[in-house]
Interface confidence: medium
């Protein structure tokens, strides 16, 4: 903490301007009025203060607003935001998307810091749900944002917000997250026609159940292998050889290269070898020809 010292004669700041960069830390503390700083925060960002000087300015704001800064100040924090701790940010009440954008801009190009994560958490909780505009903003700054949320947090995403999601936003999502997002996407895109629907839903298919994959296989969608490999194993297992052939279309040949990988290897084990042979791909490891498989066991395998 900077010691309280009297402001030297003639140095009392009347404006937040560039002359302040020549002030020593103790002079800033003594000569800059906190209320003046708060009303002219928008000017701070344009002045090349040192990190040490920014520490003093933060300290002045902390003294003025011990319960947390008002949004009028938060919106203009600029690089001073980088000085904030998650504890500081938890005291804030940020409701404006413009404020959120302004602060995310400061951190642009960097990994999501604990400060940013706390800010986003405060903002989303304040809004009650992850609406489309917020999701648009967050994924623009952090493409992996959606996949950083827990399945519980994702459940608050309304289907209408799914329109803001781009394929790359889902790259790091795990199956549990896609399980939550897929039904929302299905609802969001339900009025689209076949080919347009598939283009939109494709990124979410890692959460699709068997019956939806069966339905897609009847629509000549020609799913690529990369998408197929991301499908839920338990959703792929009940598909017949014919259904997989229809689902993949010309991409079915790619199964050979993936025969050792999940979910293909699990699916192969559950198919009759003579059915696999009809694909002409040389896939091996299916149920031996002539081997009797009881329906009871197969039902359990699919349950």
């Amino acid at each position: 903490e900077v010691e309280k010292t009297a402001c030297p004669s003639g140095k009392k700041a009347r404006e937040i301007d560039e002359s302040l960069i020549f002030y020593k830390k103790w002079e800033l503390e003594a000569c800059v009025d906190a209320a003046l700083l708060a009303t002219q925060m928008d000017r701070v960002n344009a002045i090349p203060f040192t990190y040490e000087q920014l520490d003093v300015l933060k300290h002045k704001l902390d003294e003025l607003y011990p319960q947390g800064y008002p949004e009028s100040v938060i919106q203009h924090l600029g690089y001073l935001f980088l000085k904030m701790s998650p504890e500081d940010i938890r005291k804030w009440n940020v409701t404006s998307l413009e404020t959120l954008k302004a602060l995310l801009e400061v951190n642009k190009g960097h990994e999501m810091s604990p400060q940013v994560a706390t800010l986003i958490d405060r903002f989303v909780k304040g809004r009650g749900q992850l609406d489309k505009d917020t999701l648009d903003t967050l994924t623009a700054f952090y493409p992996g944002y959606l996949c950083s949320l827990s399945p519980e947090e994702l459940s608050s995403v309304p289907p209408s917000s799914i329109w803001a999601v781009r394929p790359q936003d889902l790259d790091t999502c795990d199956p549990r997250q896609l399980d939550v997002l897929y039904p929302k996407a299905r609802l969001a895109f339900q009025n689209m026609n076949g080919s347009e629907y598939f283009v939109k839903i494709q990124s979410f298919l890692g959460g699709a159940p068997t019956e939806d994959l069966k339905a897609l296989s009847q629509q000549n969608v020609s799913m690529d292998l990369a998408t197929f490999m991301k499908l839920r194993t338990d959703a792929v297992l009940p598909l017949t050889v014919a259904e997989v052939q229809k689902l993949l279309g010309p991409h079915v040949e790619g199964l050979k290269a993936e025969e050792r990988h999940r979910p293909v290897r699990d699916w192969i084990l559950r198919q009759r070898q003579d059915d696999l042979d009809t694909l002409g791909l040389g896939l091996q490891g299916g149920i031996p020809n002539g081997y009797l498989v009881l329906d009871l066991s197969m039902q359990e395998a699919l349950s």
Epitope: K230, R262, G285, Y291, L294
Partner: antibody
Framework: QVQLQESGPGLVKPSETLSLTCTVS??????????WSWIRQPPGKGLEWIGY???????NYNPSLKSRVTISVDTSKNQFSLKLSSVTAADTAVYYC???????????WGQGTMVTVSS | DIQMTQSPSSLSASVGDRVTITCRAS??????LNWYQQKPGKAPKLLIY???SLQSGVPSGFSGSGSGTDFTLTISSLQPEDFATYYC?????????FGGGTKVEIK
Amino acid sequence: QVQLQESGPGLVKPSETLSLTCTVSGGSVSSGSYYWSWIRQPPGKGLEWIGYIYYSGSTNYNPSLKSRVTISVDTSKNQFSLKLSSVTAADTAVYYCAREGKNGAFDIWGQGTMVTVSS
Amino acid sequence: DIQMTQSPSSLSASVGDRVTITCRASQSISSYLNWYQQKPGKAPKLLIYAASSLQSGVPSGFSGSGSGTDFTLTISSLQPEDFATYYCQQSYSTPLTFGGGTKVEIK
């Protein structure tokens, strides 16, 4: 709860065939939810997966051992077996049978049986 | 074949320490990564499956994280019974492969 128990000779001569059986109790080898694997661990070394069998008879073997390995299942006895032919001293190891669930993890293991290849 | 590389191969720690073991796959394996604990003369015991899911009956002091190629097993506060060898294993692609193991010893 489900338990696995390996059985078979502890000493096998070089060039002969190693034969082990794993008996499943408290559950069924015919369950469609599991793969039944064999895994081995040479003394003081790490774990090596040998292969697995599905109740339907479908198998998947480690390519490094494929030419010498046969895994079979006997649903009537609730057992699955391992045969490893043309053994050498390098096959000396503790052999484990294990159950792999849908999540891809070996959640239940036998206690292991030491097999020494020596003349 | 997918190679699994564990580090460190051994470490010394004290009761109460936080311990982190890493496992790297030679190619992406999504979340198909499991962790096991093995004590001398015993079969391995499953701790974590699907990279981060705690196996039933395993103490909550064990946790797993990671996706793609890089994974971590963390023991938040080492207990006397946790001194053992730990293995990672990928189940994405056959042949199923294990890491070389990390031996956790008493300092």
